[in-house]
Interface confidence: low
């Protein structure tokens, strides 16, 4: 088949995979006149990764409340078992009736754009329903999401949110739009309006065209004991226990207090939809109580006292004391001072000893004073605030707040990498790679104290030795380790990290990074001796920086072979000497050779080897470096990238034959000549030709 360049450019040539994962096709190029030799286009197919969504994709939310998305709601997985951190949701279309936000990043108030499945599992992705100005009974919201995790194809998801007054909601004991209760002065009367009692959300369950023909019927099931209810000035009684939402809205319902004390009053009722002309209709209904607080006209309101934040560790429980919640009220007993939770933080809940395990929304000063009220920190370690209303039962409620700071139960110092100090500098800044503190989240406010200092250096901040520093200073690159003693290639120090009252220790390792250029090049021939010179190892920059001759000490290796000093001329006595130390000058003089051995006890073939060296220079710490190289059986036809001082015995024998091929030392400047001297004048001639050419 023939395909044109324009078809390729236009994206019209497709590859359809079938069969094995590895393969491809052969092709030739032709311009009509010339044809290139065959080419092979390799294609590797990847197994398709598929994303799938489980979970109900439905979220039930109480009106005006916050509900976390959970794995039951939204659970993504992939056929490749992808880490939940890498399963990313993008919010294509956010909620219309509220907002989506992250529990630990809620400071900006910005709409959430991305989140991961891991964050869903952690309960950190929250839907908050915002109460609309217009009443409703049940509302549906929809979030359009796109799930992605390359290389899988994106998956669109719809999260359906149901917000309903029908649900039993601990945060909102009433099923009505409003049921706030009433305050009335002793012996006086007060109007009950839709600001205090409003069932228009029941009406909202009726389609708007028919809504005007419907009403809500309130049936009083228990009358007030210390006063009277009147509708249009007519008292309600057992024979006539009803009033309507429309009468409430018109301001026709009144409570008249009978005097004689300031005890609580109220009434119980059942509310349900009523059809045209009083006909009964199916629809929502509720049974509730309406609280009436009778206020002493002469009473002084309670005075809230300053509050100290409560601090406790994540996962624990702590009692609330008068330090957190107290009021001055000479007229009221502690049991008469009531607190009500208006809004709770996400980091835990209040509970009463002996009051069940669940959260409480109402308690008294007596509960606080007796130590019965406690906070349970079951959320993340963040600060949170309870918004409370406090009342003595006679004055209007006063807003109060209780701050709770959750401390992590444990912290961990993360050490991602040792600190590397460049050899010529002798100093380096610490970063998050060396020191970073995490609890259940990152702890940017962490502080560090040196509990075991380094042996060969100092920690400096602003150029001065220090034994204490902060995470902020680390992040700004202000904390520096500097070697003060040039006798060791490594060091370590121990720190104690402190974050929000919790500590942990860690050891930071320090290593010196050698200022050495290493070029191993391609494979080196086994059985040959090659020249070690600055094309292979070069500490010239270190020499310039320190104005000294760097020294090398062989610490280890090679496993197969040895480093030798080669004689300067054929008159020099003895053969090559084993070397354990050498200098940069030796490298530059070409006095060093590496005899590359053959691995014993195995078939000839490619192998790996290395040299470990310690590099010293004046006024700087030593550093350990390694020269890793590959070896292979000698191949006379291959051009080696290093100067060869000798080739294997067998190859020399071969070299005497006229048809033998010779090694070349390309591209080194002192490469062996095409006709190696070893063939004519023996081994020393070969050395001379290569060493001093």
């Amino acid at each position: 088949r023939t395909r044109s360049g324009s078809q390729l450019d236009g994206g019209l040539v497709l590859f359809s995979h079938r069969g094995t994962l590895d393969g491809g096709f052969r092709f030739r190029l032709s311009d009509g006149e010339h044809t290139s030799p065959g080419h092979f286009f390799r294609v590797t197919a990847q197994k398709q990764v598929l994303l799938s969504l489980k979970g109900s994709q439905t979220l039930t939310v109480c009106p005006g409340s916050v509900q976390p998305l959970s794995s039951q709601t939204l659970r993504a997985s992939s056929s490749a078992g992808t880490d939940p951190q890498l399963l990313l949701y993008r919010v294509v279309r956010g909620p219309q009736l509220g907002r989506l936000f992250h529990a630990q990043q809620d400071s900006t108030g910005e709409a959430l754009v991305n989140f991961t499945q891991a964050e869903v599992y952690a309960g950190n992705i929250l839907y908050e329903h915002e109460m609309p100005p217009e009443p409703f009974w049940e509302a549906h919201d929809t979030l359009e999401l796109q799930l992605s995790s390359p290389p899988a194809r994106d998956v669109a998801a719809t999260l359906a949110v149901a917000v309903s007054f029908e649900a039993a909601c601990p945060q909102r004991p009433s099923h009505l739009w409003k049921n706030k209760g009433l305050w009335v002065p002793e012996g006086q009367r007060a109007r009950i309006t839709v600001a205090a009692l409003d069932a228009s959300n029941l009406l909202a369950s009726v389609p708007s065209p028919q809504r005007s023909e419907h009403d809500v019927l309130f049936q009083v099931t228990q009358f007030p004991s210390r006063g009277q209810l009147l509708v249009s000035e007519e008292p309600l009684h057992a024979g006539q226990p009803h009033f309507l939402q429309s009468q409430l809205a018109a301001g026709q319902l009144v409570y008249a207090h009978g005097g004689g004390g300031t005890q609580q009053d109220g009434f119980h009722f059942r509310a349900h939809l009523q059809g045209p002309a009083g006909a009964s209709v199916a629809g929502p209904q509720t049974s509730e109580a309406f609280a009436i607080t009778v206020r002493d006209v002469n009473e002084r309101p309670p005075q809230p006292q300053a509050s100290v934040p409560l601090r406790l560790t994540r996962g624990s429980r702590a009692p609330i004391s008068r330090a957190q919640l107290s009021v001055v009220d000479p007229d009221s007993a502690p049991g008469e001072i009531e607190y009500e939770v208006q809004r709770a933080p996400h980091n835990g809940f209040l509970s009463l000893v002996g009051g069940g395990l669940g959260p409480v929304t109402r308690f008294t000063q007596a509960d606080v004073d007796s130590g019965r009220l406690a906070f349970v920190a079951n959320g993340s370690s963040v600060a949170g605030i309870f918004q409370l209303s406090m009342s003595d039962g006679a004055s209007p409620p006063l807003p109060m707040s209780l701050a709770v700071d959750i401390l992590p139960s444990a912290i961990e110092v993360q050490l991602r990498a040792p600190l590397e100090v460049p050899q010529a500098l002798g100093r380096s800044s610490l970063s998050q790679q060396q020191l970073r503190v995490v609890s259940d989240r990152e702890e940017p406010e962490a502080a560090y104290r040196l509990i075991q200092g380094p042996q060969y250096g100092h920690l400096l901040v602003g150029g001065r030795p220090t034994s204490a520093f902060s995470q902020f200073q680390i992040d700004q690159g202000e904390v520096v380790f500097a070697f003060t003693n040039s006798s060791s290639s490594h060091d370590h120090f121990r720190v104690l990290a402190l974050a929000r009252g919790v500590n942990a220790s860690a050891v930071v390792n320090v290593t010196v990074r050698a200022l050495l250029h290493v070029w191993a090049g391609g494979p080196w021939p086994q059985g040959a001796t090659l020249r070690l010179d600055p094309t292979v190892l070069d500490a010239g920059e270190l020499a310039n920086r320190t104005d000294s001759v760097p020294r090398f000490r062989l610490l280890e290796g090679p496993r197969h072979g040895r480093v030798v000093r080669v004689p300067r001329a054929r008159t020099e006595p003895g053969g090559s000497q084993l070397v354990e130390q050498f200098t940069q000058q030796d490298l530059e003089d070409g006095r060093l050779g590496l005899e590359v051995g053959r691995p014993e006890g195995r078939a000839p073939g490619p192998a790996g080897d290395s040299l470990t060296l310690e590099l010293w220079a004046q006024g700087v710490p030593p550093a350990v470096a390694s020269l890793d190289f590959a070896t292979e059986p000698y191949n006379a036809a291959r051009p080696y990238s290093v100067a060869l001082l000798s080739v294997p015995e067998a190859a020399r024998t071969e070299a005497g034959k006229p048809e033998s091929s010779t090694p070349t030392g390309e591209p080194g400047p002192m490469a062996s000549s095409p006709e190696p001297a070893v063939a004519k004048g023996g081994f020393l001639s070969f050395l001379e030709a290569n060493m001093f050419s």
Epitope: T60, Q67, P68
Partner: antibody, heavy 117, light 113 residues
């Protein structure tokens, strides 16, 4: 009161399609999900999927994916369920059910669909 | 998918006696965020659609007699009819409403002994 009234029984040939309707009354149609559940003769109940009448969003059981389509007409408060490529094992009573999120509080009377050659 | 199983397949109980039906889910249906078990029970009489009895494992639907009660948590649930009446003869199904696809148990037939 809440009522879900379904269309009448049908007899279909294998390979054909069926379309069952479910007319809702007595509540705000767009406020509640409608689910479809079927029951083969003498067998148990099998959930097929849901539709949100407010947005038209749907969620089908994997088994019926590609064969089932649920739609709604808000002007008549009616939901439709169409099943294509019918086979004899699709013979069943098909129920629509109103839910508050996920449990089925009210059910239609059921529509018997017989698939036979 | 969550698989639901029921036991026994059928049972016969004398009038006024207690009938107990068990239901097991292949994975937990407890939603930790609101501490509710997403399990419902239905009653189906011949020729009729199913009728909701219990949702959230133990919440009785309005209008359902209080002789019907639900209990259990996680993966194991029970429907109890405390004093069987003649009108209770039916097939009873459990259903998980925790995640899609919503699935039903195979049903338990209750008769009078």
């Amino acid at each position: 009161q809440v009522q879900l009234v379904q269309s009448g029984a049908e007899v279909k040939r294998p390979g054909a399609s069926m379309k069952v309707s479910c007319k809702a009354s007595g509540y705000t149609f767009t406020n509640y999900y409608i689910h479809w559940v079927r029951q083969a003769p003498g067998q148990g109940l099998e959930w097929m999927g849901w539709i949100n009448p407010n947005s038209g969003a749907t969620n089908y059981a994997q088994k019926f994916q590609g064969r089932v389509t649920m739609t709604r007409d808000t002007s008549t408060s009616t939901v439709y369920m169409e099943l294509s490529s019918l086979r004899s094992e699709d013979t069943a009573v098909y129920y629509c059910a109103k839910s508050w999120v996920s449990w089925f509080a009210s059910w239609g009377q059921g529509t018997l669909v017989t698939v036979s050659s | 998918d969550i698989v639901m199983t029921q036991s026994p397949d059928s049972l016969a109980v004398s009038l006024g006696e207690r009938a107990t039906i068990n239901c097991k889910s292949s994975q937990s249906v407890l939603n930790s965020s609101n501490n509710r078990n997403y399990l419902a029970w239905y009653q189906q009489k011949p020729g009729q659609p199913p009728k909701l009895l219990i949702y959230w494992a133990s919440t009785r639907e309005s209008g359902v007699p209080d002789r019907f009660s639900g209990s259990g948590s996680g993966t194991d649930f029970t429907l109890t009819i405390s004093g069987l009446q003649a009108e209770d003869v039916a097939v009873y199904y459990c259903q998980q409403h925790y995640s899609t696809p919503f699935t039903f148990g195979p049903g338990t037939k209750v008769d009078i002994k």
